[in-house]
Structures are given as structure tokens and as C-alpha cells.
């Protein structure tokens, strides 16, 4: 590229006309401030191209950089672009006007910058000052560019004298921006909404002053744009939040909402997504199974838990035998429903030191204006077994009988066992089971009765022993799902002059003997 006259700096007179020519081996063009200028282009016989720029009626505002470049200058080397700087000294123009981008100088690190105050006359003496300050700052000045150096976060002005007139430039604001790597968080006021309700999402980025938010959302794909609002988070400088608000959601607004945040200074970016579901109407759905029969142990505390999903938040009521339950003042019942996630709830009924009377039919009902669900179960109060009576008798028939009576819920199993060697029982010799087998000379008769009011079973079992020829330790063990109890009696032969009975509780025996039940239930009564 060849420029005529070559420059690199020209000083031209106000109101004059001046012609600049640029030529090259391909089409060339004159540009100023990235804009093509009105010019005459030509192609010579020898395949050289030229462009003639005619500057007419020059004023100080024509001062500045002019470039000649190849027409398609993308990817060209720097030497394929020629720069020329023209001064047009003009006493009516003080400092060349700046646009807003030049007046506010943002930086992200301590680096040399240029305060671009430029004059039309290279002979003028220009000084730099803090705005409203008189002292000139010792910073080098280039008439084509301005003052270059490292500056503090302040406002600055340039001064010059044209004739006898002191002229000030606009103020320049130097400001360091807070920039760091980007970490985005996205959340929604709610991720499930009914149609007609609002969707509000927030995208937050911390530690950056220069961020661009871009939202991607289902409505955008159909060309319906929503204008986000950017603001600051409470008490946090550089906690910047973009809010996307979609009023009156439609079913089509369901989907993925993505917030993409970019920071142009260091080219950092991050994005996060969140799913929003728009439902036609509200819902309540049970999660998991709760068995139709539930158990609680007498005098222990029991918590019954129901998990469900709902939107909008439902009202939850508990009933027992169709009567509404509430937190009792005595603290026997506690009800609580807590939100474990946005739409998931856990409702709990806690019975403190369970009583027999608390058995019954329980229902939990969760409902709102759009839907309801209910769950029912029967609560059975389990009562550990107790042996209430163990007695031995010998009717005239010659056989000897032992009667064992006990209660519990659920229905107790009864196990009879005996031990012949009293000295070694029960530590060394395992007891033998008694029942209706032929080798045992014993018979067993068991009756079961259910007592409605006490809500428990009573078991009465009678053991008939045919031949007792030496002292025998007979044990009655009652067992159910929540415990066991036992008693022992010593049965002596008819021929012995005395009968010695000893009742032994389960605690005395250390609960060591674990025996499998053999039941012979002859009668099973309910009263």
C-alpha cells in the first residue's frame, strides 16, 4: 500500500481542501473511525488499484486517524493497512469531542491506559489534572492519542490554552471493575405452578461487575420474548441478580430454563438450568404404601408417617374413627406436617405413651381446592404377654394337671416344657417340650378368648400329665410379637408325702430358653 502524501502526520489548514491517494495491488478503501468515506476508486492499466479521498472545507473536527486498507481486509497483516494522522488546527474547536465510551474508562487490572483528550493543533501545550484540580499531573502526552499512564480510580480533565482562552476537556472517569471467575446459581420461586400462575426465576452471580445474562426458556423458542430485570442482592456489592418473570404461565411454559452468564473481560462464562413444570390444575399424590394394619406397643410412643406430593400446599387433617384429631393439650397426640421439598410433604401422627383406647380406624386427609387424597389404616395396640396364673392340681382320676393363664396382643403362643433333673435344670439340661405326642404321657387343651374392651387375647391352657413318677419342673412360656413371659411349677408324684411348688419368673431364668411353640388350640372363643 502506498499513501500520497505519505505522512505519517499531516497538518492542514482550516477551510482548505486536500486530496489523499492510496494505491495497492488489490481494491483499496479509505476509512475513518471504522467507517468507509466517500471516495473515488479506480483501476489502472497495470492492474494497480487506487482510491482518492478529497477532504473539503476542513475544520478542526476533521482531525484524527485515517486508514487506507485493502477492500477485504479481514485477516490481513498490519503492514497491509496504512495509517495517516491529520491535524487541522482550529481555534474554534477546543478538545475533540468524545463519545461516552471514551469518557468512562473501565479497567480490570492495574495496567497502562490512555485518557484520550486530543486537540486539533499539535503545537498546543496540554496538561492533565484531576477534575476540579489545578495541579498538572506528570503524565506523558501524545497529541495523536492523549495521556498514557497508570491512573487511580478518579476523574480527570485535560486543559489547554488557545490564544488567551483556557479550555477544559470533558471529565474522564477511570474506574476499576470487579471481575472474577463466574459461578452462577439459579433458583425459582417455585418449580411447579398451575397454569395462570406466575413463573419467577432468579439467576445470581457473585463477584463480578461486568456480566451479561442470557436466558433460554420454552417461550423464547416460540419467539415470545420476556424482558429480564437485573438488580442487586441485599447488602452485597457485586451480587448481581437477573430476574425472569413470566406472568400467567401456560402449559407450554413447562420445560428447561437456562441462565447463561458471560463476562467479556476475561471471556469467562457459566450456565445453570432448572426445570419448571406447569400443571393444568393442582394435585395431591400419595408416595409409597402404608399398610392397612399398623401396630403400636402399649405405653411406648409410636409415630405414623404418610409421605405425599402436592401443589399447591394442601390442608392436612387426621381423623380417628371419623372424629378430627388435634394436638392434645395433655401431649398424648402430636400432629405435624412438614415440607421436605418444594412439593413433597411428610405428615406425622405421634401417639405418646400409647393407650389401649388409641386403637382404632385412622385416616389422614390432604386436600386443596383442586384435589384431595386420603389414606386409612387400622391401628392395633400390641400388649406384651403376661402369665397371670400357673397352678397345679391332681383330680381324683389320678392324673395331674397344670393350668396356665395369660394375656397379650397379638394372640400369644403357649409353650409347655418340663425338666426332670431338678439339680441340673435349667442350666445344664435342655428342657423337653410337652404336648400331644405319644411319647409324652401328657395331653394339652388350650382355649383362646378375645376381650373386646381390653382389646387383647386371653389364653388358658391345661396340661394333663398321666404318670409323674418323680418331681418335675413344668414351665409355661407365653410369647407374642412384642415379648414373652414364663412361670414354672414343680409337680411331685402322688406317692410323695409333700408337694413343693415354686413359681419362677422369666427374669429369674435369665430368659435363656428359647423354645418353638407347639399349639393345640381346642377352643377359640371371642366375647
Amino acid at each position: 500500500l502506498v499513501i500520497t502524501p505519505p505522512g505519517p502526520e499531516l497538518i492542514l489548514n482550516v477551510s482548505s481542501t486536500f486530496v489523499l491517494t492510496c494505491s495497492g495491488s488489490a481494491p483499496v478503501v479509505w476509512e475513518r473511525m471504522s467507517q468507509e468515506l466517500p471516495q473515488e476508486m479506480a483501476k489502472a492499466q497495470d492492474n494497480t488499484f487506487s482510491s482518492v479521498l478529497t477532504l473539503t472545507n476542513l475544520t478542526g473536527l476533521d482531525t484524527g486517524e485515517y486508514f487506507c486498507t485493502y477492500n477485504d481486509s479481514r485477516g490481513l497483516e498490519p503492514d497491509e493497512r496504512k495509517r495517516l494522522y491529520i491535524f487541522v488546527p482550529d481555534p474554534t474547536v477546543g478538545f475533540l469531542p468524545n463519545d461516552a465510551e471514551e469518557l468512562f474508562i473501565f479497567l480490570t487490572e492495574i495496567t497502562e491506559i490512555t485518557i484520550p483528550c486530543r486537540v486539533t493543533d499539535p503545537q498546543l501545550v496540554v496538561t492533565l489534572h484531576e477534575k476540579k484540580g489545578d495541579i498538572a499531573l506528570p503524565v506523558p502526552y501524545d497529541h495523536q492519542r492523549g495521556f498514557s499512564g497508570i491512573f487511580e480510580d478518579r476523574s480527570y480533565i485535560c486543559k489547554t490554552t488557545i490564544g488567551d482562552r483556557e479550555v477544559d476537556s470533558d471529565a474522564y472517569y477511570v474506574y476499576r471493575l470487579q471481575v472474577s471467575s463466574i459461578n452462577v446459581s439459579v433458583n425459582a420461586v417455585q418449580t411447579v405452578v398451575r397454569q395462570g400462575e406466575n413463573i419467577t426465576l432468579m439467576c445470581i452471580v457473585i463477584g463480578n461487575e461486568v456480566v451479561n445474562f442470557e436466558w433460554m426458556y420454552p417461550r423464547k423458542e416460540s419467539g415470545r420474548l420476556v424482558e429480564p430485570v437485573t438488580d442487586f442482592l441485599l447488602d452485597m456489592p457485586y451480587h448481581i441478580r437477573s430476574i425472569l418473570h413470566i406472568p400467567s404461565a401456560e402449559l407450554e411454559d413447562s420445560g428447561t430454563y437456562t441462565c447463561n452468564v458471560t463476562e467479556s473481560v476475561n471471556d469467562h462464562q457459566d450456565e445453570k438450568a432448572i426445570n419448571i413444570t406447569v400443571v393444568e390444575s393442582g394435585y395431591v399424590r400419595l408416595l409409597g404404601e402404608v399398610g392397612a394394619l399398623q401396630f403400636a406397643e402399649l405405653h411406648r410412643s409410636r409415630t405414623l408417617q404418610v409421605v405425599f406430593e402436592a401443589y399447591p400446599p394442601p390442608t392436612v387433617l387426621w381423623f380417628k374413627d371419623n372424629r378430627t384429631l388435634g394436638d392434645s393439650s395433655a401431649g398424648e397426640i402430636a400432629l405435624s406436617t412438614r415440607n421436605v421439598s418444594e412439593t413433597r410433604y411428610v405428615s406425622e401422627l405421634t401417639l405418646v405413651r400409647v393407650k389401649v383406647a388409641e386403637a382404632g380406624h385412622y385416616t389422614m386427609r390432604a386436600f386443596h381446592e383442586d384435589a384431595e387424597v386420603q389414606l386409612s389404616f387400622q391401628l392395633q395396640i400390641n400388649v406384651p404377654v403376661r402369665v397371670l396364673e400357673l397352678s397345679e392340681s391332681h383330680p381324683d382320676s389320678g392324673e395331674q394337671t397344670v393350668r396356665c393363664r395369660g394375656r397379650g396382643m397379638p394372640q400369644p403362643n403357649i409353650i409347655w416344657s418340663a425338666c426332670r433333673d431338678l439339680k441340673r435344670c435349667p442350666r445344664e439340661l435342655p428342657p423337653m417340650l410337652l404336648g400331644n405326642s405319644s411319647e409324652e404321657e401328657s395331653q394339652l387343651e388350650t382355649n383362646v378368648t378375645y376381650w373386646e374392651e381390653e382389646q387383647e387375647f386371653e389364653v388358658v391352657s391345661t396340661l394333663r400329665l398321666q404318670h409323674v413318677d418323680r418331681p418335675l419342673s413344668v414351665r409355661c412360656t407365653l410369647r407374642n410379637a412384642v415379648g414373652q413371659d414364663m412361670q414354672e411349677v414343680i409337680v411331685v408324684p402322688h406317692s410323695l408325702p409333700f408337694k413343693e411348688q415354686k413359681l419362677i419368673s422369666e427374669e429369674d431364668l435369665g430368659g435363656e430358653q428359647k423354645l418353638i411353640s407347639e399349639e393345640d388350640l381346642h377352643h377359640h372363643h371371642h366375647h
Epitope: 468524545n98 472517569y173 451479561n212 438488580d231 442482592l233 456489592p237 463476562e263
Partner: antibody
């Protein structure tokens, strides 16, 4: 040297209209946002409206929305406030001010205050 | 809209006193807060911008601090020229709001 001069204030009846002007000198007017601020007698300052360099963005205090209109002519270095449907409560001294709003850095504006003010022009709305 | 509340409304002080004026915003404004001084019959004068940056030409006895919702203007040693009314002003989302003002008068 850097100066703003307001004009156009007068006495006007409720429901009437008025156009205020503010002329700038000593700075590149076209590079700055500009604002109107008013002060009722014996009261505090109230921001009224502002306008971006190329008039693409204009904002108003709620109490004047739909009644007042801010505009500018960069060639004439002038700012205007067209006031219609005037009310008694619009009585005030109206100041124009240079608003230091840099170009957007990302998705929001920075702000450096109102650094140059005019001397004010008085608007009285009374029957 | 964001409200600014200044306290106190009036402050009586003597020359040489340290004076503090508080400005509270109804929601976060980061540090986009400016302070102005106004004397009777005059236009306001910018003292501080961006909560704590002193405007050029403003005496160093003036200082500002705070961010989010709580801001203060402090005059370290009150001078005769400082008796005036002081206003805070916020900028957020393109609108502006001024506080109701604090009048600093001679005790």
C-alpha cells in the same frame, strides 16, 4: 465553563402545559445522560425524568408518567421537558442535571451521580 | 420503587464537630449511592458517588461508606461552609430517588 441553563418556567393554571428547556455548554452534551430534578417550595429534591444520549431510553417518576415527556436535541445541546395536564403539586423549581451514567458494562449501568446542575427555573401551577 | 430514608432530619452541630448522616434504602442498591450538598436558593452540589468515592474538588473531610441498604456520610470536622442540607440519592434499574434531606444547622 461547564454550564447548564434552564428556561421556560412560569405561572400556569392547573391542567395547562409548559415546555422547559435546558441549554448546555462547555462539554460534549451528546455523550451524557441528562436528568430533570424538581424541588417543591420548602421540600426536598425529587427526580423527575432522565434520558439516554440517543433518546433510546427514557425513564420517569411514577407521579409524572403519561403527563411529562423528556427529549433532547444534541445538535442544539438542549434538553427539554414537556409538561402537560399540570397539577398544583407540580409547583417547584425544576433543575436540569448532567447524569453520569457510563455505557453499559454487561447487563446493568454503573452510576457516578449528577455532577453538573443548572440554576433552576420556577414552575408555579395555580388557579 | 426504592425508598431512601435519611436520619436525622435536622442536626444541630458546632464548628469542629464530627457529623454523621445515615441513609437507608428499602432494598439493596449495591453501592450506587450519591451524596449532595445544597445551600438555600442554590442548586445541589455532588459530594460523593458510588457510596464512597469523593468527587473531585470536594474537601477530604467529607467521606462516605456503606453498601447494600445502609449508608453514611461523615464530615470529620464541621466547617462554617458546611452548614447546609444534605441529600442521598440512589440509582438502580434506571430510576433515581432522593432521601428527604438532613439539615445541618448551627447549634
Amino acid at each position: 465553563q461547564v454550564q447548564l441553563v434552564e428556561s421556560g418556567g412560569s405561572l400556569v393554571q392547573p391542567g395547562g402545559s409548559l415546555r422547559l428547556a435546558c441549554t448546555a455548554s462547555g462539554f460534549t452534551f451528546s455523550s451524557y445522560w441528562m436528568s430533570w430534578v424538581r424541588q417543591a417550595p420548602g421540600k426536598g429534591l425529587e427526580w423527575v425524568a432522565n434520558i439516554q444520549q440517543d433518546e433510546n431510553e427514557k425513564y420517569y417518576v411514577d407521579s409524572v408518567k403519561g403527563r411529562f415527556s423528556i427529549s433532547r436535541d444534541n445538535a442544539k445541546k438542549s434538553l427539554y421537558l414537556q409538561m402537560n395536564s399540570l397539577r398544583v403539586e407540580d409547583t417547584a423549581v425544576y433543575f436540569c442535571a448532567r447524569d453520569l451514567v457510563p455505557p453499559r458494562q454487561g447487563d446493568y449501568y454503573h452510576y457516578f451521580g449528577m455532577d453538573v446542575w443548572g440554576q433552576g427555573t420556577t414552575v408555579t401551577v395555580s388557579s | 420503587d426504592i425508598q431512601l430514608t435519611q436520619s436525622p432530619s435536622t442536626l444541630s452541630a458546632s464548628v469542629g464537630d464530627r457529623v454523621t448522616i445515615t441513609c437507608r434504602a428499602s432494598q439493596s442498591i449495591s453501592d450506587w449511592l450519591a451524596w449532595y450538598q445544597q445551600k438555600p436558593g442554590k442548586a445541589p452540589n455532588l459530594l460523593i458517588y458510588k457510596a464512597s468515592t469523593l468527587e473531585s474538588g470536594v474537601p477530604s473531610r467529607f467521606s462516605g461508606s456503606g453498601s447494600g441498604t445502609e449508608f453514611t456520610l461523615t464530615i470529620s470536622s464541621l466547617q462554617p461552609d458546611d452548614f447546609a442540607t444534605y441529600y442521598c440519592q440512589q440509582y438502580n434499574s434506571y430510576s433515581r430517588t432522593f432521601g428527604q434531606g438532613t439539615k445541618v444547622e448551627i447549634k
